[in-house]
């Protein structure tokens, strides 16, 4: 039982499923990164607190022409209850620091693993 990959199918979908998929996508990005991610584009750093998913999307959506994070952008939109457009900053309460997309993804990944560990799947 220590190596449970998936639950019996068909069966109830665990609440962890969507967060697991997002984490796996960010892991893929960090592991497959060869050249600077998104050509070294800079994005607003976010507070990893309430409203974090919308804030993350609002920050990343301003990166255009970067196919590596397009799936992440789509997945984050599933966690954010409102529509997010480029240039929108309603959830980004503090916009004082910009970091590279690669660092943003690493920070987000660490935090999402913490949420997973804590059983916070909302």
């Amino acid at each position: 039982l220590t190596c449970l990959g998936g639950f019996a199918s068909p069966g109830p979908v665990p609440p962890s499923t969507a967060l697991r998929e997002l984490i796996e996508e960010l892991v893929n990005i960090t592991q497959n990164q060869k050249a600077p991610l998104c050509n070294g584009s800079m994005v607003w750093s976010i507070n990893l607190t309430a409203g974090m998913y919308c804030a993350a999307l609002e920050s990343l959506i301003n990166v255009s022409g970067c196919s590596a994070i397009e799936k992440t952008q789509r997945m984050l939109s599933g966690f954010c209850p409102h529509k997010v457009s480029a240039g929108q900053f309603s959830s980004l309460h503090v916009r004082d620091t910009k970091i590279e997309v690669a660092q943003f993804v690493k920070d987000l990944l660490l935090h999402l693993k913490k949420l997973f560990r804590e059983g916070q799947f909302n």
Epitope: T2, C3, L4, G5, P14, S16, R20, I23, E24, V27, K113, F116, R117, E118, G119, Q120, F121, N122
Partner: nanobody, 119 residues
Framework: EVQLLESGGGLVQPGGSLRLSCAAS????????MAWVRQAPGKGLEWVST???????TYYADSVKGRTISRDNSKNTLYLQMNSLRAEDTAVYYC?????????????WGQGTLVTVSS
């Protein structure tokens, strides 16, 4: 050493109730989400319910509505209150500790407690 020890299972008639407990040790219980997972005879593992580290968020499989997951962080104990039990609830019930890995949602499991619903 992390240990999860389930108790409270047994033989109960249809419509009856049981409260399962899971005593945790060897880690900071209050920092981790916990879950109940069950395995019916001859079937695969089935997720039942999840509770967040602080108890604020709870999640249930549709098939087990009417159950209540709870935790007492001061006692390092996880609970599952099961009312209106049916024959389909017969299974070994495991508690599990959340930790992300590519292979699994959990890094530690208990040894399980058997619930048998029969008249």
């Amino acid at each position: 050493e992390v240990q999860l020890l389930e108790s409270g299972g047994g033989l109960v008639q249809p419509g009856g109730s049981l409260r399962l407990s899971c005593a945790a040790s060897g880690f900071t219980f209050a920092d981790y989400g916990m879950a109940w997972v069950r395995q019916a005879p001859g079937k695969g593992l089935e997720w039942v319910s999840t509770i967040s580290y602080n108890g604020l968020y709870t999640y249930y499989a549709d098939s087990v509505k009417g159950r209540t997951i709870s935790r007492d962080n001061s006692k390092n104990t996880l609970y599952l209150q099961m009312n209106s039990l049916r024959a389909e609830d017969t299974a070994v019930y495991y508690c599990a500790k959340y930790e992300y890995s590519p292979e699994s949602d959990f890094d530690y499991w208990g040894q399980g407690t058997l619930v048998t619903v029969s008249s």
